[in-house]
Amino acid sequence: SEVEYIAEVGQNAYLPCSYTPAPPGNLVPVCWGKGACPVFDCSNVVLRTDNRDVNDRTSGRYWLKGDFHKGDVSLTIENVTLADSGVYCCRIQIPGIMNDEKHNVKLVVIKPAKVTPAPTLQRDLTSAFPRMLTTGEHGPAETQTPGSLPDVNLTVSNFFCELQIFTLTNELRDSGATIRTA
């Protein structure tokens, strides 16, 4: 099943996707579409690249902010709304018949939490997962204890049982954090 990402209304959502150009600099077209990856191409294209640059974008809210020329084609959706929720397809269009790499990612947009996160929750999260907290858009930041959690990404590895993930996800929802579950 697709990896799930949670973002608050009004925040930026980050949906990761990447490939390794071979040889380096030999870029391939990529499309991002709303909806699970279909057999061919992308449905409901929100952004498309060619071998050089982004050449089609349905809204100014969709951006590739990573190092596109090194294969980082992660999608940033700015100022998300509830309507942005759903499955997105990142399709890396490798030349040849049926060679495309297809990645489905699920974005869940939630309403901003009204409750200020408890300090104990912050400390517990930081000590439990010291290397999994990220404060930037593009991957792990240095280990730190954040003063607040509105823009934190947390990766929960799949060895946790579903109950733990469910509980943690609900706690984070209440705290207004952003969570990635792998």
Epitope: G35, A36, V39, F40, D41, S43, V87
Partner: antibody, heavy 116, light 107 residues
Framework: EVQLVESGGDLVQPGGSLRLSCAAS????????MTWVRQAPGRGLEWVAN????????YYVDSVKGRFTLSRDDAKNSLYLQMNSLRAEDTAVYYC?????????WGQGTLVTVSS | ETVMTQSPATLSVSPGERATLSCRAN??????LAWYQQKPGQAPRLLIY???TRATGFPARFSGSGSGTEFTLTISSLQSEDFAVYYC?????????FGGGTKVEIK
């Protein structure tokens, strides 16, 4: 107005060949995937083949692989289906349609009958 | 391949009544599903795509729902022009496949 007009259907003997054409108008042909779908008499629909915008990729259902060849001529706004080694089970109305995954415009179809 | 099963094969309905058509996939197709309407002697017309998005030219009495393996096409109040054959088609898995169709006929 989008229009797709197929031609080339005929009665042909088993083992014979036919070339179907689809003339497109009313849209920018070169920017769309194009598809052939067929429908045997009194039966349902079957996807046959499709071709990417630039012609760089073509896909075929297993039952026609190696026998049918899809091509396009963007200068003429035309789609073609070369059908060789025809079999009785290829008898159908062949529709040209616009799109890759789902098909928003269809032609009226051309009937291919394979019979001795 | 993904097998699409439509039921019932024939649906007899009086004008003004509600019609509910079912389409089932034997594996997950997410929301990558389309519905087509075909009248005798005519080409199919795209009715619904992405499981629930109505295509241009069709009124609001047509609605699609479902995801995964179970899908429904609902016609809230059948009009005379709605009597036709309806096909579902999945575009999530190779190859693209259609259901066998449901014929909606006048009761």
């Amino acid at each position: 107005e989008v229009q797709l007009v197929e031609s080339g259907g005929d009665l042909v003997q088993p083992g014979g060949s036919l070339r179907l054409s689809c003339a497109a108008s009313g849209f920018t042909f070169s920017t769309y995937w194009m598809t052939w779908v067929r429908q045997a008499p009194g039966r349902g629909l079957e996807w046959v083949a499709n071709i990417k915008q630039d012609g760089s990729a073509k896909y075929y259902v297993d039952s026609v692989k190696g026998r049918f060849t899809l091509s396009r001529d963007d200068a003429k706004n035309s789609l073609y289906l070369q059908m060789n080694s025809l079999r009785a089970e290829d008898t159908a109305v062949y529709y040209c349609a616009r799109g890759s995954n789902w098909f928003d415009y269809w032609g009226q179809g051309t009937l291919v009958t394979v019979s001795s | 391949e993904t097998v699409m099963t439509q039921s019932p094969a024939t649906l007899s309905v009086s004008p003004g009544e509600r019609a509910t058509l079912s389409c089932r996939a034997n594996q997950n197709v997410y929301s990558n599903l389309a519905w087509y309407q075909q009248k005798p002697g005519q080409a199919p017309r795209l009715l619904i795509y992405d499981a629930s998005t109505r295509a241009t030219g069709f009124p609001a009495r047509f609605s699609g729902s479902g995801s995964g393996t179970e899908f429904t096409l609902t016609i809230s109040s059948l009009q005379s022009e709605d009597f036709a054959v309806y096909y579902c088609q999945q575009y999530n898995n190779w190859p693209l496949t259609f259901g066998g169709g449901t014929k909606v006929e006048i009761k």
